[in-house]
Interface confidence: low
């Protein structure tokens, strides 16, 4: 089999791999996150939920202890019992959702008659939450803003230095003409340059 065909088949197989299911909920509403672990007749299970952090780390607090952002997390399926017979057991109930609840959650099912562990992931997207306060937005993107400003200052310094060096070396002897100096104003003026380069807030999100 040719390498190209192998790569094509591999990419097809990858695209067919089951994606982590996503649950969308409107801000401040309650949501039931289903446990997507593969079901096995070894029941009843004891379920535990964790929220996965961006770095792959796990927030190890148990959801039923209400540690996650002060929200109320309710587990059905603990010790094989659940609230309503028509509801899927082992789901995670999050009340009064906020944008903080968005993220990836993992459920782990443990069988007391053998400790068989099964796990599944689900992504929660909380939509329609009011915009964050300006200081929160600034805190969130502080590193990006500082880096951007540093780059702007660096390029400004480089341009100014280049222009001065060029003038000193008389590379551009005719550039002292008024018309040409006016042409360079947008570049050499830091305020105007910043105005051209600084992205709008929407671009930072």
């Amino acid at each position: 089999m040719s390498r190209g065909l192998q790569l094509l088949l591999l990419s097809c197989a990858y695209s067919l791999a089951p994606a982590t299911p996503e649950v969308k909920v409107a801000c401040s509403e309650d949501v039931d996150l289903p446990c997507t672990a593969p079901w096995d007749p070894q029941v009843p299970y004891t379920v535990s939920w964790v929220k996965l952090l961006e770095g792959g780390e796990e927030r190890m607090e148990t959801p039923q202890e209400d540690h996650l952002r002060g929200q109320h997390y309710h587990q059905k399926g603990q010790n094989g019992s659940f609230d309503a017979p028509n509801e899927r057991p082992y789901s995670l109930k999050i009340r009064n959702t906020t944008s903080c609840n968005s993220g990836t959650y993992r459920c782990t099912l443990q069988d007391p008659d053998g400790q068989r562990n099964l796990s599944g992931k689900v992504i929660l997207r909380v939509t329609g939450c009011p915009a964050q306060r300006k200081e929160e937005t600034f805190k969130k993107y502080r590193a990006e803003i500082v880096l951007l400003l540093a780059l702007v200052i660096f390029y400004l310094t480089l341009i100014i230095f280049t222009c001065k060096f060029a003038r000193l070396q008389s590379i551009f002897p005719d550039f002292s003409k008024a018309g040409m100096e006016r042409a360079f104003l947008p570049v050499t003026s830091p305020n105007k340059h910043l105005g051209l380069v600084t992205p709008h807030k929407t671009e930072l999100v």
Epitope: W39, P41, Q42, V43, P85, R88, P89, D113, G114
Partner: antibody, heavy 115, light 109 residues
Framework: EVQLVQSGGAVVQPGRSLRLSCAAS????????MHWVRQAPGKGLEWVAA????????YYADFVKGRFTISRDNPKNTLYLQMNSLRADDTAVYYC????????WGQGTTVTVSS | LTQSPLSLPVTLGQPASISCKSS???????????LNWFQQRPGQSPRRLIY???NRDSGVPDRFSGSGSGTDFTLKISRVEAEDVGVYYC?????????FGQGTKVEIK
Amino acid sequence: EVQLVQSGGAVVQPGRSLRLSCAASGFTFSTYGMHWVRQAPGKGLEWVAAVSYDGSNKYYADFVKGRFTISRDNPKNTLYLQMNSLRADDTAVYYCARRGGLDIWGQGTTVTVSS
Amino acid sequence: LTQSPLSLPVTLGQPASISCKSSQSLVDSDGNTYLNWFQQRPGQSPRRLIYKVSNRDSGVPDRFSGSGSGTDFTLKISRVEAEDVGVYYCMQGTHWPRTFGQGTKVEIK
């Protein structure tokens, strides 16, 4: 008391159908996976089929695939085994059992397939 | 699963041992080993004695014990009593389909 009470066993002709029932009591039936195991006369135990607590997952032994169907009615606390196209070698005592570890067993019901 | 011996005549009060060998490892991806032992007395339904290799079910006398790992497992009866007569089966719960051993008939000499 936790128990499984079976019914539905009978003498049937080859090619005919039969439905076995297993009524559960003394535990929350809807939270347990359930199994069917059979035992031919003078032989050992043979696993037949299993169903997850909510009926969404079903597993079968190769020799019954396409002929037998396992199902459950949680509100009625009852497990079923629908047996179609019965053959002489399906003659056995059929047991229902609870969860993957088969910790509780029914009393068994006899199915005889004979012409 | 292959059990041996298929027949085990024992003297009351003496120990008995039954072997169960699997053609493949019974260690699950979760690290656990799902090997159960059942007792079937004459004319009765099977009864589970041991689950997950060595865990005794409630109500099971402590003269019954299970051991082993991977593919080789053993059920031991430290002192056989008259009520222990019957057929003993091992069963694996790691792979689908579930499978039983052929059974070992324990009888008094």
